[in-house]
């Protein structure tokens, strides 16, 4: 999915809102310097590629953050300001219901979630252009 | 292990600038956020703002905006804090702190006093 | 920005005493707080984070407790050590605020 055409600040907006504190939640414990930060974006439309494949695409150690809080909430924001995104995505969520797992929070799982703090916090930079 | 390590203390007068260096070494240095805290005589303490060594990418507290402007020097592992049109009121001691992507301050530098007199 | 309203502002206290130090968030911070303690010419030094977690080499006579909007900072047997000033912060949203700090004195 191109995610050009998504209404950023709408998308920002809802980060501040609500996702960046299911983030605190899911990562509450974890010690600050836990994990060094190795995933970067360097425009809007790329942090938000990143963003997707790191929420919703299962990696080894960690399959499960899909179902998570800030997960579900990415993609409704995702489905909302982001023209067409979410018909591309019916395929992607059939195959994942079949795949449905018991919620394991791994230290995989809480390495990516870091990550994924850092992809929304660049993406939230108010000079990162749209290209 | 992880060491910040700060410039000596600092005499301004009014009207000028002063610039603090904070030494990192213990870790990878683009890999954490490098912030600056400060606390005026007997006060509380103020987060001034963030630098991402990774890109040099700042943002500021709205109270330093368009005053504070922290750089990085990645040859030597260092960051610096500058501050402008000092005035008696940022006498204070300034702290580099370290921080994930969760912020809380594991990591201090031992602190620069910067007095602002005329 | 988050106001971090923390009391008391000054504690007196003798060794052993046990004493609560409290912090008031002006909106939900989860569970996103430190506690740091500080002496004079001195960096903070963290004690907690995430409300209740220990940092390494903390002394298990300080805890952490709270959620949402109100924080408490336990010392359960004071000792000598501890008397210094206190802080709490909140990192749960930008810009991030620490409260005014408690100094706990000698009775």
């Known amino acids: 999915y191109d995610f050009t055409n998504c209404d950023f600040e709408k998308i920002k907006a809802a980060y501040l809102s609500t996702i960046s504190k299911d983030l605190i939640t899911y990562m509450s414990g974890t010690k600050s310097t836990e994990f060094n930060n190795t995933v970067s974006c360097s425009n809007r439309p790329h942090c938000l590629t990143e963003i997707q494949s790191l929420t919703f695409n299962p990696t080894a150690g960690c399959a499960s953050l899909a179902k998570e809080m800030f997960a579900m909430k990415t993609k409704a924001a995702l489905a909302i300001w982001c023209p067409g995104y979410s018909e591309t995505q019916i395929n992607a969520t059939q195959a994942m219901k079949k795949r449905r797992k018991r919620k394991v929070t791994t230290n995989k799982c809480l390495e990516q979630v870091s990550q994924l703090q850092g992809l929304w916090r660049r993406f939230n930079r108010p000079l990162l252009k749209q290209q | 292990q992880v060491q910040l390590v700060q410039s000596g203390a600092e005499v301004k007068k009014p009207g000028a600038s002063v610039k603090v260096s904070c030494k990192a070494s213990g870790y990878t240095f683009t890999s954490y956020l490098m912030h600056w805290v400060r606390q005026a005589p007997g006060q509380g303490l103020e987060w001034i703002g963030e630098?991402?060594?990774?890109?040099?990418?700042?943002d500021y507290n709205q109270n330093f905006r368009g005053r504070a402007t922290m750089t990085v020097d990645m040859s030597t592992s260092t960051v610096y804090m500058e501050l402008s049109s000092l005035r008696s009121e940022d006498t204070a001691v300034y702290y580099c702190a370290l921080t994930g992507t969760i912020n809380y301050f594991d990591y201090w530098g031992q602190g620069t006093l910067v007095t602002v007199s005329s | 920005d988050i106001q971090m309203t923390q009391s008391p502002s000054f504690l007196s206290a003798s060794v052993g005493d046990r004493v609560t130090i409290t912090c008031k968030a002006s909106?939900?911070?989860?569970?996103?707080v430190a506690w740091y303690q500080q002496k004079p010419g001195k960096a903070p030094k963290l004690l907690i984070y995430?409300?209740?977690m220990r940092h390494t080499g903390v002394p298990s006579r300080f805890s952490g407790s709270g959620s949402g909007t109100e924080f408490t900072l336990t010392i359960s047997s004071l000792q000598p050590e501890d008397f210094a000033t206190y802080f709490c912060?909140?990192?749960?949203?930008?810009?991030?605020?620490f409260g005014q700090g408690t100094k706990l004195e000698i009775k």
């Open positions: 630098i991402d060594p990774s890109d040099s990418y700042t």
């Open positions: 909106q939900d911070v989860v569970t996103a």
């Open positions: 995430w409300a209740s």
């Open positions: 912060q909140q990192y749960s949203s930008f810009t991030f605020t």
